[in-house]
Each structure stands twice: as C-alpha cells, then as structure tokens.
Interface confidence: medium
C-alpha cells in the first residue's frame, strides 16, 4: 500500500491555516484499522499518532517552512510512510503603513493620554513598528508582534509633545513607513491678568484707559471679556494667543471694580478684580483716577 | 431696541441649498458673537454654528460640519447660515441668537426651514 | 462633548406651588451655566446666566443655584405665565455649546 502527503492549501501564506491528510489511495479503509502520526522535518506535529488521517494546523508562519510527511501503521505495528513533500510558507511584504492618534484628529488636551497607532493594510509574520518623532525621525519605541497593529501611549501629554509624527513596519522585505501625523496639544486658559494703562500716573477724567488682559498659558484662538462691576463692557479676540485690550474714554461712573476672563473652549477663567478709585489731589481743579 | 430677525427659511428637497440671514439692529453688532441655534418639530434646543465678533473664527456641530457655513457682514449688520446638502433631519425653525459672553442673551423669533421631496 | 441632563422631563404643578429643575452635567462647567424659558411658538428667554444671577427684567421669584455639576432653577411661587418649557445650556466647554433635553412645567 502507497502512502501519500497532502497539504491544502500547497503553498499557505503566514497566518492562514493548512490541513495535511494521510491518503491511502489503494487500501479499503475496512481493510485495517490505522494509526497516523504527522512529522515536519524530524519532529512530530500535534497529537503524535491519532487514528485521524487529518491534521489541522490553524495558521502558518514563515518558520513553517520546511519538508513534511505523515506514517501509518496498523494495530500489527506496520509502518507506512509518505514521500516527503516540501510546504513554504508565503510571507506578505508589509503595505499602506498608516498613523492614526487615540484621541482622533490629533487633538489632545495637555495632560491627557494620547495614543499613536500603526496600522498595516497588509503584511504577515512579526512585524517590527516603530515610531518617530518630528520629521528628522527621534526614534521613539519599536515593538515587534504578530499584528497589523501596535501602539505606543503617552500617558500625560506635554506642550512639547506636539510635534509631527510617523510610523514605521517592516517584516523582513525593508522598511515601510505611515505618512506624517501632527499633534496638537490643547491648553487650557491659565488665569489671566488684568492690566489698567493710562497715558499719565494720574488718569483723568476723558482720558483713555486701557484694559489689557492676558492669559500666559492657553491655546489660541481666545476670547477675552472685560467687565466693569460685573457688568460686560465687551469683548476682545487674540488669534495667535497672547493679551487683547479694551479701550475706554474715562467718566466719573468709571470708578469700581475692572475684571476680565478668558475663554478657550476649554473652560474659561475670570481675573482678579481691579479697583479703579476716583481721588481729589488737594488745589486740583478736577477729578483724577488711582488704581 | 434690540432686535435679531431671521429670514431665507422655506421648503427644500434633500440635496438642495439654502441661505438664512439674520439682521441686527439697536446694538453694535461688531462687538459681539453670534449663533445659530435650532429646534427640529417637538425637539430641544440644538447649538448649530458660532462665528466671533471680528469672524476671524467659526465653529460648528457635527452634524453639520463640512456642509454649513456660518459668515457675517459687520458692515450691514447681518449674519448668514449657507446651508448645503440639506438633509430632511435639518428640517427646524433656525434661530440665531447674541453671544453675550455669559449667555445667549438676545435671540431672533426664528425661521422655518423645511426639507422634504 | 460635555452632556446636560435636565430632570425631571415633565413637572406637573399649581399655580402658587414651588418649582425645582435640575440639570446636571456629564463633567464640571464651573458656574458657566444658563437656564432659558421657551413658549410654544416662540424664541428663547434668557432666565439666568452665571448659574445663579437673573437676566435683565426676570421677576425675583426665579433663582438659579449650583455649581460644577449639580444645577438648579427654583421657582419660588408658580404665575400662569411660568409654564413652559425650561432648557440648561453650559458656556464653559465649546465647541459645542451645549443645551439639556428639557423640562416641561405643566398646569396640573
């Protein structure tokens, strides 16, 4: 009796699985009872000897590779053996690298967790990603793992975390990188502070005061508001971050309390107050402002 | 006085465009922000687009992102919600309302806008 | 996205009786938070800003408590003219400026 060695599919790619049957073309199964053992190489696969003629095997790998035979004997401890057949296993160059961020957009609050995942659309086998930072490439971590995705975490992001980004996948057929990604980092508004200018020492009435308000820390574009005992006098906008002021022609009603807020979208702050006090130098003719 | 009046509301088809606008007057229209807000039928309040005092910056929901843009003319008072692609889920009365900082403290009566084939 | 709840969704009440609506939002707002009243066929009314102080022309029995998450409007003492709907709206986080579900006050 004639033994032979069959793998479906012949010729696998990594990660799909192969079925290998023991056939016995010329022998009615009726005839005797078998025993079937599975070897790669010089090693048993599986079970050892089972009485199934079927091994299923649920993914290759590129280490798969290699010569493959099976053995049957029956209860009297005849032994048949398979020819050898040669099985490789087809590795799939890695391809469309991308870089996608956990926050999506690439907005992320300072302090906040950001993730940076790589993604292969195709590729088998371990693949090692790597990621960098800015577009000269500061190598960041690499990590190797049987996956078309990996990730790499920034648990408490910092202003100068925002930078460009990009990825790397390789699995033997050279380096293939994602496209560049840019972190923004957010920043709240800190507490702003609230300035009063006037053009002397000793503002006086129809002089022009202005309020400048100024938050040091926060992501632009903010708003800022200016109040006068809690009463809103307007509003001022600074793009590309920074103070905004607010001009006022001075009248007696001006005296009080001067305050300002800032507002970034992600959450607004209120200044200090600013105490404008009307007071009559002695001899003077008319009323001047103190801060 | 006061007062925000919204116009350009109608029936559409799905698919279609539609321009609202909203005319100020009694107050100095440059200093402020202003909103668009609507309510679909027997809905809540829904916040739909911002634009800054000076509209160097605008801001919108999802919903509506990439297909409504808000925009403002300083010089004849007036705000203005182009709105494209339209959906039978915009279907809403529109209104537009004063950003007072703290609040939307001013708000037009509104404008039925109505999409259906 | 910050989420306002408005509870209860119906309050069913007498004229004279005290009226309490909550909001509550899904992450601290400070005290950036207003409250409107809306009639059937009709705009928004600015109740209250800044959590607790009344818009220009709002009668005193109106008062807004609250901070960070937990928000309230109290009506002292129910007018005929006070049933309608009531929304939350928070002015700390944006985009998006958002609005609560809202509460119906209803004649009982």
């Known amino acids: 009796a004639e033994l032979f060695l069959i793998a479906s599919p012949s010729h696998p790619t990594e990660g799909s699985p192969v079925t290998l049957t023991c056939k016995m073309p010329f022998l009615q199964s009726s005839d005797a009872q078998f025993q079937f053992c599975f070897f790669r190489d010089t090693r048993a696969l599986g079970p050892g000897w089972s009485s199934s003629p079927k091994l299923q095997i649920a993914a290759m790998w590129k280490e798969d590779t290699g010569s493959y035979w099976c053995e049957a004997q029956t209860m009297a401890s005849k032994v048949l053996r398979s020819r050898r057949s040669q099985i490789n296993v087809h590795r799939v160059p890695v391809a469309d690298v991308s870089l996608e961020t956990q926050p999506p957009g690439g907005q992320v609050m300072e302090g906040d967790r950001l993730v940076l995942i790589c993604s292969v659309a195709m590729g088998t086998g371990d693949i090692t990603f790597l990621w960098y930072k800015g577009a000269v490439g500061l190598n960041l971590q690499s990590k190797t793992q049987r996956s078309l995705t990996a990730e790499y975490e920034i648990p408490s992001v910092r202003e100068s975390d925002a930078e460009q980004y990009y990825c790397v996948a390789e699995n033997g057929y050279g380096p293939s990188p994602s496209g560049l990604v840019s972190i923004t980092v957010r920043i709240p508004v800190s507490r702003p502070i609230l300035m009063l200018r006037a053009p002397r020492a000793q503002a006086a009435v129809e002089d022009v005061l202005e309020l400048h308000c100024e938050a040091l820390r926060g992501s632009p574009p903010i708003l800022y508001w200016f109040y006068h005992e809690d009463i809103t006098l307007g509003s001022r906008s600074a793009p590309s971050g920074g103070g905004a002021s607010f001009n006022l022609s001075l009248t007696e009603e001006h005296s009080g309390n001067y305050s300002c807020e800032a507002n970034n979208g992600l959450g607004a702050q209120r200044s200090e107050a600013v105490t404008l006090n009307f007071t009559v130098p002695t001899g003077a003719r008319s009323n001047h402002l103190t801060s | 006085q006061v007062q925000l009046v919204e116009s350009g509301g109608g029936v559409v088809q799905p698919g279609r465009s539609l321009r609202l606008s909203c005319a100020a007057s009694?107050?100095?229209?440059?200093?402020?922000?202003m909103h668009w807000v609507r309510q679909a039928p027997g809905k809540g309040l829904e916040w739909v687009a911002v634009?800054?005092?000076?509209?160097?910056?605008?801001y919108y929901a999802d919903s509506v992102k990439g297909r409504f843009t808000i925009s403002r003319d300083n010089s004849k008072n007036t705000l203005y919600l182009q709105m494209n692609s339209l959906r039978a889920e915009d279907t809403a009365v529109y209104y537009c309302?004063?950003?007072?900082?703290?609040?939307?403290?001013?708000w037009g009566q509104g404008t039925m806008v109505t999409v259906s084939s | 996205e910050i989420v306002l709840t408005q509870s209860p969704a119906t309050l069913s009440l007498s004229p004279g009786e005290r009226a309490t609506l909550s909001c509550r939002a899904s992450q601290s707002v400070s005290s950036y938070l207003a409250w409107y009243q809306q009639k059937p066929g009709q705009a928004p009314r600015l109740l209250i800003y800044?959590?607790?102080n009344r818009a220009t022309g709002i009668p005193a029995r109106f008062s807004g408590s609250g901070s960070g998450t937990d928000f309230t409007l109290t009506i002292s003492s129910l007018e005929p003219e006070d049933f309608a709907l009531y929304y939350c709206q928070q002015l700390n986080n944006w985009p998006p400026y958002t609005f609560g579900q809202g509460t119906k006050l209803e004649i009982k």
């Open positions: 634009i800054w005092y000076d509209g160097n910056n605008k």
């Open positions: 009694g107050f100095t229209f440059s200093d402020y922000g």
């Open positions: 800044d959590a607790s």
């Open positions: 309302a004063r950003d007072w900082g703290r609040a939307f403290d001013i």
